[in-house]
């Protein structure tokens, strides 16, 4: 019989910015191969994807995911019911809205079914992992001869989001940025009528309802000026 021995080598210790516990192993090997880190993102509080890099496994391994909520009524261990795949190998789990509880500590456990004692557990604060959909329905209003107001909508509670507006003219090489709070409107006080302006917006679940670091995708851009201003000088809808 031609079997193989696994021997770890090296003494580097690793730390991570999440809580991670790895079960010890009873095998001859001194240490168990670490499981990949699970990354979870809650998309507009409609569904959540928890994914891992299946390619880091040295052989094809259908890792399994379980989850629960710590110290809550939802502390029963749940199996993933909707796996995501990469090259026929599990690489993530999708949870639906009813399974998402933003303000309870989410515990996610990854396990190797071939070696059940090889498992890792992470604890995540889901309110810091929300990514809203991109802002929609951008509109521009001309408040005066030189002042423009940009408005937009979000498919989420407005007070939970902050926004970043970028604009530039066709003469600019880079964007000008302006942070906007939950009010989802932005005024540009001084507009040059000879230039064409482009605006776009993105949003983030911060700071009132969570402390997310990730922004939404950018909205579709909206344009104003020169070649569009003749059509309707007072209102401009979305131009993709």
């Amino acid at each position: 019989l031609n079997t193989t021995i696994l021997t770890p080598n090296g003494n580097e210790d690793t730390t991570a910015d999440f809580f991670l516990t790895t079960m010890p192993t009873d095998s001859l090997s001194v240490s168990t191969l670490p499981l990949p880190e699970v990354q979870c993102f809650v998309f507009n509080v409609e569904y959540m994807n928890c994914t891992w890099n299946s390619s880091s496994e040295p052989q094809p391994t259908n890792l399994t995911l379980h989850y629960w909520y710590k110290n809550s009524d939802n502390d029963k261990v749940q199996k993933c019911s909707h796996y995501l795949f990469s090259e026929e190998i599990t690489s993530g789990c999708q949870l639906q809205k009813k399974e998402i509880h933003l303000y309870q500590t989410f515990v996610v456990q990854l396990q190797d079914p071939r070696e059940p004692r090889r498992q890792a557990t992470q604890m995540l604060k889901l309110q810091n992992l929300v990514i809203p959909w991109a802002p929609e329905n951008l509109t521009l209003h001309k408040l005066s001869e030189s002042q423009l107001e940009l408005n937009w909508n979000n498919r989420f509670l407005n007070h939970c989001l902050e926004h970043l507006v970028q604009y530039r003219t066709d003469w600019d090489h880079s964007w000008t940025e302006q942070s906007v709070d939950y009010r989802h409107k932005f005024s540009l006080p001084s507009v040059d009528g000879q230039k064409r302006y482009t605006f776009r917006v993105r949003s983030r679940f911060n700071p009132l309802c969570g402390s997310a670091q990730h922004w939404s995708e950018w909205s579709h851009p909206i344009h104003w000026g020169s070649n569009t201003s003749k059509e309707n000088p007072f209102l401009f809808a979305l131009e993709a």
Partner: antibody, heavy 122, light 108 residues
């Protein structure tokens, strides 16, 4: 484009140590999705996988049992290479030795070294 | 360990022929089966991965099929440059990674 360049002597005396090195360009030996393998080929044994090393927050090594008592595979991060040592060689270890990279999620050998014929003879 | 058995071990064929090489695994390996071509003095070259996916740059006359334990490499119309040795390899359960013993394809 990943390239693997092998170096090492082509003639080794019985009972001595066979040493080969595989230089990596276009990738890092510390990649967290690659495994770095040694394979040999002889008329009597065909293609025979010898072992591998890979980095997943620390270094791991797997060896085929047929050679595990005599083999060492070591990464060298400073030179971006990995090496093979086979101790106490016999004429049975005469073969063409290859280094090769495997990556997930498809798990095939896409990149190979050019091969080194090692003859064990006095 | 998973053993890989190729058949035939050698094969004579003519340019234009359709050729089939089989590979059997000692236990199920899903679709984690790769095929390589090797010419004298050269390293093996990947032809087919994941049982049926054609590697970039490989001519479409090469195809692979199978799942579980039984796999096939087919060359639809042999070209002069196809005369070589072909190997299957499993990566489903590693270590160890195991190869078939090879099929030598010769000119008739």
């Amino acid at each position: 484009q990943v390239q693997l360049q092998q170096s090492g002597p082509g003639l080794v005396k019985p009972s001595q140590t066979l040493s080969l090195t595989c230089d990596i360009s276009g990738d890092s030996v510390s990649s967290n999705i690659a495994t770095w393998n040694w394979i040999r080929q002889s008329p009597s044994r065909g293609l025979e996988w010898l072992g591998r090393t890979y980095y997943r927050s620390k270094w791991y090594k797997d060896y085929a049992v047929s050679v595990k008592s005599r083999i060492t595979i070591n990464p060298d991060t400073s030179k971006n290479q990995f090496s093979l040592q086979v101790n106490s060689v016999t004429p049975e270890d005469t073969a063409v030795y290859y280094c090769a990279r495997m990556t997930g999620p498809r798990y095939y050998f896409e990149y190979w070294g050019q091969g080194t014929l090692v003859t064990v003879s006095s | 360990d998973i053993q890989m058995t190729q058949s035939p071990s050698s094969l004579s064929a003519s340019v234009g022929d359709r050729v089939t090489i089989t590979c059997r695994a000692s236990q199920s390996i899903s679709s984690y089966l790769n095929w390589y071509q090797q010419k004298p003095g050269k390293a093996p070259k990947l032809l087919i991965y994941a049982a049926s996916s054609l590697q970039s740059g490989v001519p479409s006359r090469f195809s692979g099929s199978g799942s579980g334990t039984d796999f096939t490499l087919t060359i639809s119309s042999l070209q002069p440059e196809d005369f070589a040795t072909y190997y299957c390899q499993q990566s489903y359960s590693t270590p160890p990674i195991t190869f078939g013993q090879g099929t030598r394809l010769e000119i008739k």
